[in-house]
């Protein structure tokens, strides 16, 4: 009888010999619960677990706390992998986070954090980041120190406003802060002077809504 192999992340998938981009079934740490994720096996050596993707506006990202917890969308297109899985995974070992961005003029940039993890749900999936490098700005567009995650029905930001309702989407809002990759998707020629678009301030500045974004993680010792 063939032994059932389970993978915690795309790095393990890659190391097992599966080196083709695509959707793979991953297993929660210390559990039999499964989740489908897209694995990028080509970029920067491969083994990347995609935890977020925006590319065409086909998926609504103004979702509830529960939806951001368990994930939504389609791993082959626009999706959010799920805060609970990412939290559990990134607390098992050290992970890096790479954020890849595209603007509407054909430019690409990235931000790489050498250490990334999310706190538990009890701590509102607070983001923790260290060691920024990359081409998408010398200053982190995710506010430091990291903030709690907020959604339209879970207001944990540092503003006595409701950032998730004002700027749309779930994110680690400050008050409200220089980034939101889960904002409203605006098509070309409608993507400037937007309050609530897909923003990475320290790359594109005020009011610019990006064309595409990918957030991906990989063990630091890969």
């Amino acid at each position: 009888k063939e032994e059932q192999i389970s993978f915690r992340d795309c790095a393990e998938v890659f190391k097992s010999g599966h080196t083709t981009n695509g959707i793979y079934t991953l297993t929660f740490p210390n559990s039999t619960e499964e989740i489908k994720a897209y694995c990028d096996m080509e970029a920067g050596g491969g083994g990347w677990t995609i935890i977020q993707r925006r590319e065409d506006g086909s998926v609504d990202f103004q979702r509830t706390w529960k939806e951001y917890k368990v994930g939504f969308g389609n791993p082959s297109g626009e999706y959010w992998l799920g805060n609970e899985f990412v939290s559990q995974l990134t607390n098992q070992q050290r992970y890096v986070l790479k954020i890849h961005l595209k603007d509407w003029e054909g430019n690409e940039a990235y931000s790489l954090y050498e250490h990334f993890y999310l706190s538990s749900e009890e701590l509102n999936y607070r983001i923790h980041l260290k060691g920024l490098t990359g081409t998408a700005g010398k200053i982190s567009s995710i506010s430091q120190p990291g903030n709690d995650f907020s959604t339209k029905d879970g207001d944990n930001d540092k503003c006595i406003c409701k950032c998730s309702q004002m700027l749309t989407g779930g994110w680690w809002f400050d008050a409200c802060g220089p980034s939101n990759l889960n904002g409203m998707y605006y098509p070309q020629r409608q993507n400037t002077n937007k309050f609530n678009g897909i923003k990475w301030y320290y790359w594109k500045g005020s009011g610019y809504s990006l064309k595409a974004t990918t957030m991906m993680i990989r063990p630091a010792d890969f």
């Epitope: 503003c159 950032c163 309050f195 301030y201 005020s206 009011g207």
Partner: antibody, heavy 129, light 109 residues
Framework: QVQLVQSGAEVKKPGASVKVSCKAS????????MHWVRQAPGQGLEWMGW????????NYAQKFQGRVTMTRDTSISTAYMELSRLRSDDTAVYYC??????????????????????WGQGTMVTVSS | SYVLTQPPSVSVAPGQTARITCGGN??????VHWYQQKPGQAPVLVVY???DRPSGIPERFSGSNSGNTATLTISRVEAGDEADYYC???????????FGGGTKLTVLS
């Protein structure tokens, strides 16, 4: 922690000017408006105006136009309120208070009227001959 | 300019419910904020955007706003709630903040 610390009490003569400072700490100074509110003895709160520390833009209450000047020094995260041509009825406690600018990174010129979530301890200004 | 009217004083026994009103023309169309000020201290925000509470403010404090009246409600009143309470709105026509005249809440002993 987040706090606003104001300068000490002042005693001034009528016709003089007073400049009160408000030092911010524990947050992104540029991302919050700074307001000035005064309270005469036994009276209510009176809004004087705000400054946007990011741009330096100001909005003064009509009553104080021409007499009040609000400035800031972002390098030391400090806001200032100067009131000139003082009269005896300017005797009051002067407070600074911040309110968030949630659109700071989208459009620095757009004012969002959020409540004042943190206040300074107040500065007593006495105008007397 | 926009005017907010508050009763000068409200008295309530401990454990009872206090209601402080703030009147203004069509105030229901505006966001109302409420501040508590104890003697010799700076004001503290207790309710914002009509009915939301900042972190650290007890659930006993709540707010509502419709028509021409906004109301701050303090349930199960305690002696420590004795203070002046001010309502506040942004008057978009003048681009000015406006405070009500304040209400002194007395907790009867």
């Amino acid at each position: 922690q987040v706090q606003l610390v104001q300068s000490g009490a002042e005693v001034k003569k009528p016709g003089a000017s007073v400049k009160v400072s408000c030092k911010a700490s524990g947050y992104n100074f540029a991302g919050y408006y700074m307001h000035w509110v005064r309270q005469a003895p036994g009276q209510g709160l009176e809004w004087m105006g705000w400054i946007n520390p990011n741009s330096g833009g100001t909005n003064y209450a009509q009553k104080f136009q021409g007499r009040v000047t609000m400035t800031r020094d972002t390098s030391i995260s400090t806001a200032y309120m100067e009131l000139s041509r003082l009269r005896s009825d300017d005797t009051a406690v002067y407070y600074c208070a911040r309110s968030p600018n949630p659109y700071y990174y989208e459009s620095p010129g757009y004012y969002y009227p959020a409540a004042f979530d943190i206040w300074g301890q107040g500065t007593m200004v006495t105008v007397s001959s | 300019s926009y005017v907010l009217t508050q009763p000068p004083s409200v008295s309530v026994a401990p454990g009872q419910t206090a209601r402080i009103t703030c009147g203004g023309n069509n105030i229901g169309s505006k966001s109302v904020h409420w501040y508590q000020q104890k003697p010799g201290q700076a004001p503290v925000l207790v309710v914002y955007d009509d009915s939301d509470r900042p972190s650290g403010i007890p659930e006993r404090f709540s707010g509502s706003n419709s028509g021409n009246t906004a109301t701050l409600t303090i349930s199960r009143v305690e002696a420590g709630d004795e203070a002046d309470y001010y309502c506040q709105v942004w008057d978009s026509s003048s681009d000015h903040w406006v405070f009500g005249g304040g209400t002194k809440l007395t907790v009867l002993s």
